[in-house]
């Protein structure tokens, strides 16, 4: 059996070397001499040498300073063999623990750290963690054992100690309140690691720590108070610009300015903001009117983007606004008047009063009208007072200026401003209906066969309005109904049947027709009827002499 | 504060007239225009005229044979007159200041309305 | 006569919910004078006079909440209230005073869902 006490071998040993370590035996060396000899990492397989063995005494022996950071346990078998080379013993395994000394220091993982934290964060508040490691022992000895500590802190403001290490983690947190990003940005901490639990073996590195906006700082007007002025009836019209300052992080949520009107409940106002600058651009809504309100008195707020992280005054402006007067035109009351009129209206007599305001109120200025437009030229306005007048008949009938029994003229007011100004206003005449036509037939030229002939319809018209319209009475005068008759076409009256009472020779006849409407108002007209050497329904034909009251008389 | 408050007859007998008194306060009826509209039971608005400050009137053509306005500017009155009425001018009737302010800016919608007086035209 | 059309006759609406009713006049509202829309939006809640909400067609009357909107030009009009609440359960008129005579929409009845 082989007797092999526990081997260790301190790492970094002074020489001499070869040193003893322990000596191998086996128990069979009683009965013969045995030779000794060992395999493996560090005797015959690399590194090799590192250990040897007296083949007869079976010390065992270390050859050079051991690395335990390289080699921390070596493995070898034993081997005793008798004189013959006879194994006498089945190999043995021997470890050998290189046991640590405190040869490495900490190492951070990294020279620069970096780490961020919001303004006015509360102690107690992680920032980062910061790590070093350690290449010696950490399970059997101290030599690993790593303590961080805060060696610097730049700037020392608003106190030297803002942050603490946890000794055993590295985790940073904030120990001081006081953060403000727009006082100091960045911190620069010289941190150390250390082991022995900080009594041993340090190394240095630098934590930096960005202290990242929140919105602690309101906008500030700078100035508070503005002018500007702005002419009336014009909207998208820049009126002045707002200045701001922020503190906070430029082109953020937390600097980006909302500017606010406190006192605009019409809706008169707007304000934008330059997202360059961060101004704010005040323009009207809509259009102002001096003649209501010459001045106005803004008080606008600010505030920003995202709400303040803690209670901050709200700033505000006062900004005055004067509205500039100019001159406008004058205005019809209401822009389209309807006026209902009889066209039998008479010539020189006053239809209706048309007038305009002028919203220069306080111009005092004098409005004058005229007719603008008056295509049948049957109006006259007086020019101070926008009486309107008939100058000659009115004629509903009139279709060429008549739509729908309306007539359209346009009036214009210009007043003595500078420059005149010139409104318009439409007048419509809606010219009810008297019996001022009587009916006429349609058509007036009538052709029949000499053979045959087949009867005429001749259409009653009438350019009236019922009731001064069909049914309508026909009647043939002059001696007329000697050779013709007539006869009703349909209930309404509104078209007749002419026809021959005879055969009639080949000429032109006149023919004398009384038309009458509904109101018994009465038209004697003269048919022009030519009878034509054909049969049947007739064509046009040649004129021959008119024959008086259905006569022929001879050319 | 302005009030329009309008008393009328409440019934009104086929064939015969309509007299409505529209009493005003809180504005001038020299400066102010005064319009009529009536609302028939259920149904939409009818324009049926108007009164301006200077006594100018304005009638709804279709109505202007039956209808007349006059008013007593000293005793802040408007007076609604109609004649031949039948059932379908049963109806509320309303008196309405129209804005006017300032020349024109304001123009001529109806801001004040009387709480109106119930017509039925019923034998 | 200009004739004013309301649609729809009837909008049901939850409240909280934004309601929007449309006008059309048979012709132009729009003055050339003064660039006005001679267009009116009034409110009758029931057994009550009209309220006048809105002139010149965006105008809101002095007392009206924000919530009520007019917008429009020439012949197309709305009014939209952004939130409703239950107290806006009326007919809605408009008017328009650019001709006499003067007419009215047939209304728009908004009911709260």
């Known amino acids: 059996d082989w007797v092999i006490p526990p081997i260790s071998c301190p790492e970094n040993e002074k020489g001499p070397f070869p040193k003893n370590l322990v000596q191998i035996k086996s128990n069979k060396d009683k009965e013969g001499k045995v030779f000794y000899s060992i395999t493996g990492q560090g005797a015959d397989t690399p590194p090799v040498g590192v250990f040897i063995i007296e083949r007869e005494t079976g010390w065992l022996k270390v050859t050079e300073p051991l690395d335990r950071e390289r080699i921390a346990t070596y493995t070898l078998f034993s081997h005793a063999v008798s004189s013959n080379g006879n194994a006498v013993e089945d190999p043995m395994e021997i470890l050998i623990t290189v046991t640590d000394q405190n040869d490495n220091k900490p190492e951070f993982t990294q020279e620069v750290f970096k780490g961020s934290v919001m303004e006015g964060a509360l102690p107690g508040t992680s920032v980062m963690e910061v790590t070093a490691t350690d290449a010696d022992d950490d399970v059997n000895t101290y030599n690993a054992a790593i303590a961080y500590t805060i060696l610097s802190q730049d700037p020392e403001l608003p106190d030297k100690n803002m942050f603490t290490i946890n000794r055993n983690t590295g985790v940073i947190s904030v120990v001081t309140t006081g953060l403000d990003r727009e006082s100091f940005p960045t911190y620069t901490l010289v941190v150390q690691a250390a082991d022995l639990q900080g009594e041993g073996l340090s190394t240095t590195a630098t934590a930096v720590i960005t202290v990242t906006d929140t919105n602690d700082n309101p906008p500030i007007f700078n100035p508070t108070t503005y002018k500007g002025q702005v002419p009336e009836n014009e909207a998208n019209v820049v009126i002045t610009t707002l200045k701001v300052t922020d503190a906070d992080a430029p082109n953020t949520p937390a600097w980006e300015a909302v500017y606010t009107i406190l006192n605009d409940d019409g809706g008169q106002f707007v304000v934008t903001t330059n997202p360059v600058n961060n101004d704010g651009i005040l323009k009207t809504a809509k259009g102002l009117d001096f003649e209501a309100k010459q001045q106005y008195i803004l008080h606008v707020a600010v505030t920003n983007v995202v709400p303040f992280e803690v209670s901050l005054t709200t700033s505000t402006a006062t900004v005055t606004v004067d509205v500039l007067d100019v001159n406008e035109a004058p205005i019809f009351v209401p822009p389209e008047k309807r006026v209902e009129v009889s066209e039998d209206f008479g010539v020189g007599q006053e239809i209706t009063s048309y007038t305009a305001q002028e919203p220069d109120t306080f111009m005092e200025q004098k409005i004058t009208y005229r007719i603008w437009r008056d295509t049948a030229n049957w109006l006259e306005i007086n020019p101070d007072t926008g009486a309107i007048s008939t100058r000659a008949e009115l004629d509903r009938e009139d279709f060429e200026h008549v739509k729908n029994s309306t007539y359209t003229a346009l009036i214009i007011a210009t007043d003595n401003g500078s420059p005149v100004a010139t409104g318009t206003g439409t007048l419509l005449l809606i010219l009810s209906d008297v019996n001022d036509n009587a009916p006429i037939p349609e058509p007036r030229t009538i052709f029949f066969c000499e053979r045959n002939p087949k009867p005429q319809v001749i259409n009653i018209i009438d350019a009236d309005l019922p009731p001064n319209t069909s049914p309508f009475t026909a009647e043939l005068t002059h001696g007329a109904s000697a050779n013709w008759t007539i006869q009703y076409n349909d209930p309404t009256q509104e078209s007749i049947i002419l026809k021959p009472k005879m055969a009639l020779e080949v000429g032109d006849y006149k023919i004398n027709l009384k038309l009458m409407d509904n109101q018994n108002k009465d038209q004697v007209t003269t048919l022009e009827v030519s009878v034509c050497d054909c049969e049947g329904a007739a064509g046009v034909c040649r004129k021959a002499q008119p024959v008086e009251a259905g006569l022929q008389i001879p050319a | 504060q302005v009030q329009l408050k309008e008393s009328g007859p409440g019934l009104v007998a086929p064939s015969q007239s309509l007299s409505i008194t529209c009493t005003v306060s809180g504005f001038s009826l020299s400066r102010y225009s005064v319009h009529w509209v009536r609302q028939p039971p259920g149904k939409g608005l009818e324009w049926l005229g108007m009164i301006w400050g200077g006594g100018s009137i304005d009638y709804n053509s279709g109505l202007k044979s039956r209808l007349s306005i006059s008013k007593d500017n000293s005793k802040s009155q408007v007076f609604l007159k109609m004649n031949s009425l039948q059932s379908d001018d049963t109806a509320m009737y309303h008196c309405?200041?129209?804005?006017?302010?300032?020349?024109?800016?304001?123009?001529?919608?109806?801001?004040?309305w009387g709480q109106g007086t119930s017509v039925t035209v019923s034998s | 006569d200009i004739v004013m059309s309301q649609s729809p006759s009837s909008l049901t609406v939850s409240v909280g919910e934004k309601g929007t009713m449309s006008c059309k006049s048979s012709?132009?509202?729009?003055?050339?004078?003064?660039?006005?829309?001679?267009l009116a939006w009034y409110q009758q809640k029931p057994g009550q006079s009209p309220k006048l909400l809105i002139y010149?067609?965006?105008t809101r009357e002095s007392g009206v909440p924000d919530r009520f909107t007019g917008s429009g030009s020439g012949t197309d009009f709305s009014l939209t209230i952004s939130s409703v609440l239950a107290e806006d359960l009326a007919v809605y008129f408009c008017h328009q005073y650019y001709s006499s005579p003067y007419t009215f929409g047939g209304g728009t009845k908004l009911e709260i869902k």
């Open positions: 010149w067609a965006s």
């Open positions: 012709q132009s509202l729009l003055y050339s004078s003064n660039q006005k829309n001679y």
């Open positions: 309405v200041r129209a804005q006017f302010y300032y020349g024109y800016d304001g123009g001529y919608a109806m801001d004040y």
